[in-house]
Amino acid sequence: AVDLTLLANLRLTDPQRFFLTCVSGEAGAGRGSDAWGPPLLLEKDDRIVRTPPGPPLRLARNGSHQVTLRGFSKPSDLVGVFSCVGGAGARRTRVIYVHNSPGAHLLPDKVTHTVNKGDTAVLSARVHKEKQTDVIWKSNGSYFYTLDWHEAQDGRFLLQLPNVQPPSSGIYSATYLEASPLGSAFFRLIVRGCGAGRWGPGCTKECPGCLHGGVCHDHDGECVCPPGFTGTRCEQACREGRFGQSCQEQCPGISGCRGLTFCLPDPYGCSCGSGWRGSQCQEACAPGHFGADCRLQCQCQNGGTCDRFSGCVCPSGWHGVHCEKSDRIPQILNMASELEFNLETMPRINCAAAGNPFPVRGSIELRKPDGTVLLSTKAIVEPEKTTAEFEVPRLVLADSGFWECRVSTSGGQDSRRFKVNVKVPPVPLAAPRLLTKQSRQLVVSPLVSFSGDGPISTVRLHYRPQDSTMDWSTIVVDPSENVTLMNLRPKTGYSVRVQLSRPGEGGEGAWGPPTLMTTDCPEPLLQPWLEGWHVEGTDRLRVSWSLPLVPGPLVGDGFLLRLWDGTRGQERRENVSSPQARTALLTGLTPGTHYQLDVQLYHCTLLGPASPPAHVLLPPSGPPAPRHLHAQALSDSEIQLTWKHPEALPGPISKYVVEVQVAGGAGDPLWIDVDRPEETSTIIRGLNASTRYLFRMRASIQGLGDWSNTVEESTLGNGLQAEGPVQESRAAEEGLDQ
């Protein structure tokens, strides 16, 4: 079972001093969202017992395995159900504490009732403040039964629940009719999933015989030991004031565990600590009683004395729960209550015994859960004991369970059961994850989900180039850290696999699935420099650059041009995808802007050093487009263009530029300047006959303006081919006169 304890401090004179603490003895408990599991949760559960809203409770984490709830302002804050949740994955466990008001009308004789499937459970509510009215019983907040107030027996209202089944488990309450729910008696009923002494899916397995009030868990057959006891069968008492599965926790305060209620995972429930009893766990056990809630009786023999925390303390020469066994009877010594081995290992198990007559090798045997008896292969005989060594055949999962070492001599016999846990070495369910890559190294997150059992003691990362038959390289890493694989080849695929190990011999699991991780290209090292640039318009810039000459092939896939507009805080990036390119036209720039310009060589995703930057000023934007452009063929080699000046000019036009292009032609267009800005007409000469041309034009002030609409016109007739278009301008009026 999960090592989880919910402690309730029951000093109820002052609710503000009341606190609940949840303590986990699990490895790595409560660390949060790392690979080792979720944190401890401690909260009030208002689903069944609703109390008036108050200020929120304060949750304080004390280290990684303890959480405390405080901030109770009035007694009604305490009434109800509290729960602590701890453990990870399938081991996630909820521990529940039910708090009753000491001033309630009805009080439970016993809060927690753990019963077996098929038993009859009897809940008893003691009358504390009498009301001559009906008593309403509820189960998990819903109506369950009514008792007439005349049905009280010896001042108690009893609810009999015959033949209980696991679904009957839950919170029960007894309340006087139409009285405040805070005056109720609250109970917790835990119904084990099996009959007495049985556990397992079909209840076919036999419980180990839990001692000292321990309760056999119906799922795993383990004993959930009362606070203050430990061991596979709860056979060992902790020192006073200690609790936890290994007695590792200490009760807070100078009065030890006085005034504390301990709640443990089901099917145990809650009780006082060992040596204490009473509704507030403040009364010491009466003479002759010991253990949690003082439920156990000592009945010591042969001069043994009763200790209220541990039971019988035997005089020299005697041992046993009641000091009933003479030391002359053989006795198993110092047998661990629990051993852990990995699947398919062949461990050696030692079992030591003493007694009179002295045990010899043949008198000590080891019995497996399936009844197989192993005889020792060798024995070490010392003056005070004999230690038999057993070589265990290859372990299988079915070997998990309770083993028994037994010694028999003519003086009698003794046996000691111990639990063997056969653990499955962990096997990764997924491949490791690539975090970052460079040309010669890969950074990998190795810890993945796995099948089998933890904890993970070591992580091995195996890697080699893809499709290689060479030996795998291996690196052993800390489970919680990322791994850097170094000294790799650039631009190479590597097959990477994880192998996990758990503690102990044979704890190495099978390798996990492979994944392909590819190193990056080598970084480009050449630094380009900018040869020059010229403005081809208010928003166009042509840039050229060079690279230093070096022997060997060029390491690079292309160039990245960067334009930084410092005024607006904007960067423009232009990708030139040919490593042979040495020039680029940048368009769509912002007119009238200062740019800082540089160029870098890139290879894969890596950038080389940037060129020294250049500073470029684009001219401001030009004037609007000329209006109503019109073309009229005059001859087989001449076409006249007419237009109207642009509107809303920001200044005087310095010239017009006409663009001439053969319709459907593949060649570059021809630009012709009209240097007399007052003109609104021009004749383009030297054209080819019977040829369709496209024309558009724009004005220039400080910079070139927007293009006009494009017009089409064909030259006339079938004349000779001209040498190429030229232009003649005149004022529109003059053209009309002609």
Partner: antibody, heavy 118, light 108 residues
């Protein structure tokens, strides 16, 4: 679905007897306190009698004490009201009702009419 | 024994708010329950424990209780709300259930 179905009503002469039944379904009958409530024609509701789950404890209104007997058979999920020495003022619709977890009636039957007349 | 007093009738226009009272000595110290009984039908619990509504009862029905008067309030009254309404308490002195005389609600 909780259902309560009364039967056994009818015309009876003063001084006569009648036994009403209430068949319950849709809930665990043996856990609930059950009641009879009546309503005279054109009048309000009047509580008549109640019985606890075990059947061992009963309650009666003063107007019927000594004449009416409430009982139940948990194995048959049925509530009964044995009415003796009937009077004209016992003429009413008799309702069977279930008590909830408070002092209220959360489910009622449709009622059965008892007429006491010569 | 408790005596519960209700007005014989209350009339409101549809869409308005109806308030039905139930008077009794220190009724605020008891839990009051309200039932609706439409003509020719069995009573139906509409409010219990002063102010709680069973599932299926519209939010238009609400209750309150203090001093010597408990109140059933029906907002946005509909024609379908026309019925007799009874208050009820449990008399802890006699262990009897006590009903008020009933109030007929009419939607004008």
């Amino acid at each position: 679905e909780v259902q309560l179905l009364e039967s056994g009503g009818g015309l009876v002469q003063p001084g006569g007897s009648l036994r009403l039944s209430c068949a319950a379904s849709g809930f665990t009958f043996s856990r609930y306190v059950m009641f009879w409530v009546r309503q005279a024609p054109g009048k309000g509701l009047e509580w008549v009698s109640g019985i606890y789950p075990s059947g061992g404890h009963t309650r009666y209104a003063d107007s019927v004490k000594g004449r009416f007997t409430i009982s139940r058979d948990n194995s048959k999920n049925t509530l009964y009201l044995q009415m003796n020495s009937l009077r004209a003022e016992d003429t009413a619709v008799y309702y069977c009702a279930r008590r909830g977890s408070g002092g209220y009636f959360d489910y009622w039957g449709q009622g059965t009419l008892v007429t006491v007349s010569s | 024994q408790s005596e519960l007093t209700q007005p014989p009738s209350v009339s409101v226009a549809p869409g308005q708010t109806a308030v039905i009272t139930c008077g009794g000595s220190n009724i605020g110290g008891k839990s009051v329950h309200w039932y609706q009984q439409k003509s020719g039908q069995a009573p139906v619990l509409v409010v219990f424990d002063d102010r709680d509504r069973p599932s299926g009862i519209p939010e238009r029905f609400s209750g309150s209780n203090s001093g010597n008067t408990a109140t059933l309030t029906i907002t946005r009254v509909e024609v379908g709300d026309e019925a007799d309404y009874y208050c009820q308490v449990w008399d802890s002195g006699t262990d009897h259930r006590v009903f008020g005389g009933g109030t007929r609600l009419t939607a004008l």
